[in-house]
Interface confidence: low
């Protein structure tokens, strides 16, 4: 009896695992084996596919074959008993295009009101993703074990912390990887569950803010209790994404070690240009809080988004305001190399009623003023870039009296 070729061959590639599955054409024929050949682009000869020769089942693994994952290959299969079937050719494919991202490895650490998630690719030193290893982003689904209500968190990196959770509560989550550059979404990891710890005696510091004064950064935060000491640490935001190197460590800011106030001041030159993460921890000598939420801190924006400097020319019914570059210490103007918009607030000195003008221009007219009246003006700058949505603090208020009537020209 002639053997029929196997049909419906499926190629499944997950990370560096290459699996072939197919259907038997004739279930009634026993003791049939199956063999595959492969052919690379531009080659005429077929080569035996190692790992997929004389297979008795309908599945085989050819992961051991060292392929160029970006090169198209073609497969063919036949059935064998005493004789052989004709070859059945599988549509050619490129392994990288066909590959799926496998489930990532997930490791959880619990705090009282937070969970730290460490994520790494499921296949270490993967050949498939060798050129894309740093481009993995992850998304996760998290839920309280007791309720099952899911929350999705997109676009996270290899270390992520989820805050504002309840103490002594079991949370479950699953994570999948994505390579946005290649439009690939991976499969979910197994579900991992962890119980948050008993509520810590000391809460973490809150509302951390960075501002610039002279050539120093001023870091401020809020804390519930008095007589505490605080420490501040920093980390490059890039390292947060890619903790491959063992220099991935939070580092102390020495000027902010064991400070007794809810602020610390340190020189701007501590940080080279870049984006950093900052966190603060409180201690009362016996107990230590968990770390605060991490805040992102961009030196370019933080350092240079100073309040605008302006001059006022007073007329009888208006002010002309001329906005200049802010000054650093030493009276050097700061060069702003990104577009700003200006918010100008003005009010009559004897009243609290404020009016606001938003302008892109650096010369602004404030109209409809009363003659011989004192008005006060303050201004601040905003970046126009949505991603870096930052505002300077307001400048100090400047108060001027309008001129007598009929001097508007």
């Amino acid at each position: 009896k002639n053997l029929k070729s196997p049909q419906k061959v499926e190629v499944d590639i997950i990370d560096d695992n290459f699996i072939l599955r197919w259907n038997r054409s004739d279930e009634s024929v026993g003791n049939v084996t199956f063999s595959f050949d492969y052919q690379k682009t531009g080659m005429d000869n077929w080569i035996k596919l190692s790992g997929c020769q004389n297979i008795t089942s309908t599945k085989c693994n050819f992961s051991s074959l060292k392929l160029n994952v970006y090169e198209e290959i073609k497969l063919r299969i036949r059935a064998e008993k005493e004789n052989t079937s004709s070859w059945y050719e599988v549509d050619s494919f490129t392994p990288f295009r066909k590959a799926q991202i496998g489930p990532p490895e997930v490791h959880l650490e619990a705090e009282d009101k937070a969970i730290v998630i460490h994520i790494s690719p499921g296949t270490k030193d993967s050949v498939m993703w060798a050129l894309d290893g740093l481009s993995f982003t992850y998304s996760l689904v998290i839920w309280k074990n007791s309720s099952g209500v899911e929350e999705r968190i997109e676009n996270i990196y290899s270390r992520h912390k989820i805050y504002k959770l309840s103490p002594e509560t079991t949370y479950c989550l699953k994570v999948k990887a994505a390579l946005l550059t290649s439009w690939k979404i991976g499969v979910y990891s197994p579900v991992h569950c962890i119980k948050t710890t008993v509520e810590n005696e000391l809460p973490p510091p809150e509302n951390i803010e960075v501002s610039v004064q002279n050539q120093n950064y001023v870091l401020k935060w809020d804390y519930t209790y008095a007589n505490m000491t605080f420490q501040v640490q920093w980390l490059h935001a890039f390292l947060k994404r890619n903790p491959g190197n063992h220099l991935y460590k939070w580092k102390q800011i020495p000027d902010c070690e064991n400070v007794k106030t809810t602020q610390c001041v340190f020189p701007q030159n501590v940080f080279q240009k870049g984006i950093y993460l900052l966190r603060v921890q409180a201690s009362d000598g016996n107990n230590t809080s968990f770390w605060s939420e991490e805040i992102k801190f961009d030196t370019e924006i933080q350092a240079f988004l100073l309040p605008p400097v302006f001059n006022i020319r007073s007329l009888s019914d208006s002010f002309h305001i001329y906005i200049g570059a802010p000054k650093q210490s030493g009276n050097t103007p700061v060069i702003q190399d990104y577009p700003l918009i200006y918010e100008i607030i003005f009010w009559e000195n004897t009243s609290n009623a404020e009016r606001k003008i938003i302008e892109k221009k650096t010369d602004v007219t404030v109209p409809n003023l009363k003659p011989l009246t004192v008005y006060c003006v303050k201004a601040r700058a905003h970046t126009m870039d949505e991603k870096l949505n930052k505002s300077s603090v307001f400048s100090d208020a400047v108060c001027e009296k309008t001129k007598p009537g009929n001097t508007s020209k």
Epitope: L239, N245, L247, K251, I253, Q272, G274
Partner: antibody
Framework: QVTLKESGPGILQPSQTLSLTCTFS??????????VGWIRQPSGKGLEWLAN???????YYNPSLKNRLTISKDTSNNQAFLKITNVDTADTATYFC????????????????WGQGASVTVSS | DVVLTQTPGSLSVTLGDQASISCRSS???????????LEWYLQKSGQSPQLLIY???NRFSGVPDRFIGSGSGTDFTLKISRVEPEDLGVYYC?????????FGAGTKLELK
């Protein structure tokens, strides 16, 4: 003043386990950002970084020797240890321990103080 | 692993001469924090190495200013402006940007 001193068996036979101790003073492995590294130098040859351990017990091993190395510490006695299993004549070298502070604020050096070295010979 | 290639392998000088040692890396040594973890050590005969230069060009405390480190990316140089007797020994470059940390093979500085 920071000092480090290595001690070891001096001589051992192939397939045995080499145990080295680094006793240091002038700093503590309890301090944030502090680490100790082990480096070796075969006679008349170059230097090879083997492993290091951080204040928070994080460890790093050179992948080429990872399966044979174990680094540990005893902070209360200011000591760090390195074990190398299944030694061979190729492991004959002077073994140094060195202070390895976390590169960070202001002083971005990786190694700032070395021990005098402990000579180890593997011979049958 | 990152390979650091030092040239020359040995250098014969007269006291008071300038000496120059090159260290070339197989990959850029600028780390993602924009810092370059490239250091120079001197190992005198029978002694352990001592740190001279860190971060390409920063002199470690107590190191005389005749030692000058320079370079970026993959090419680095150590210059000794006027060689003195205590400068003789083997010089190693060392990188800690990539795992594993690696050393150059060394350059022996000796008298003519």
């Amino acid at each position: 003043q920071v000092t480090l001193k290595e001690s070891g068996p001096g001589i051992l036979q192939p397939s045995q386990t080499l145990s080295l101790t680094c006793t240091f003073s002038g700093f503590s492995l309890n301090t944030y950002g502090m680490g100790v590294g082990w480096i070796r130098q075969p006679s008349g040859k170059g230097l090879e970084w083997l492993a290091n351990i951080w204040w928070d017990d994080d460890k790093y091993y050179n992948p080429s020797l990872k399966n044979r190395l174990t680094i540990s510490k005893d902070t209360s006695n200011n000591q760090a240890f390195l074990k190398i299993t299944n030694v061979d004549t190729a492991d004959t070298a002077t073994y140094f321990c060195a202070r390895h502070p976390l590169p960070g604020y202001k002083d971005n050096y990786v190694v700032d103080a070395w021990g005098q070295g402990a000579s180890v010979t593997v011979s049958s | 692993d990152v390979v650091l290639t030092q040239t020359p392998g040995s250098l014969s000088v007269t006291l008071g001469d300038q000496a120059s040692i090159s260290c070339r890396s197989s990959q850029s040594l600028e780390y993602s924090d924009q810092y370059t973890y490239l250091e120079w050590y001197l190992q005198k005969s029978g002694q352990s190495p001592q740190l001279l230069i860190y971060g390409v060009s920063n002199r470690f405390s107590g190191v005389p200013d005749r030692f000058i480190g320079s370079g970026s990316g993959t090419d680095f140089t150590l210059k000794i402006s006027r060689v003195e007797p205590e400068d003789l020994g083997v010089y190693y470059c060392f990188q800690a940007t990539h795992d594993p940390y690696t050393f150059g093979a060394g350059t022996k500085l000796e008298l003519k």
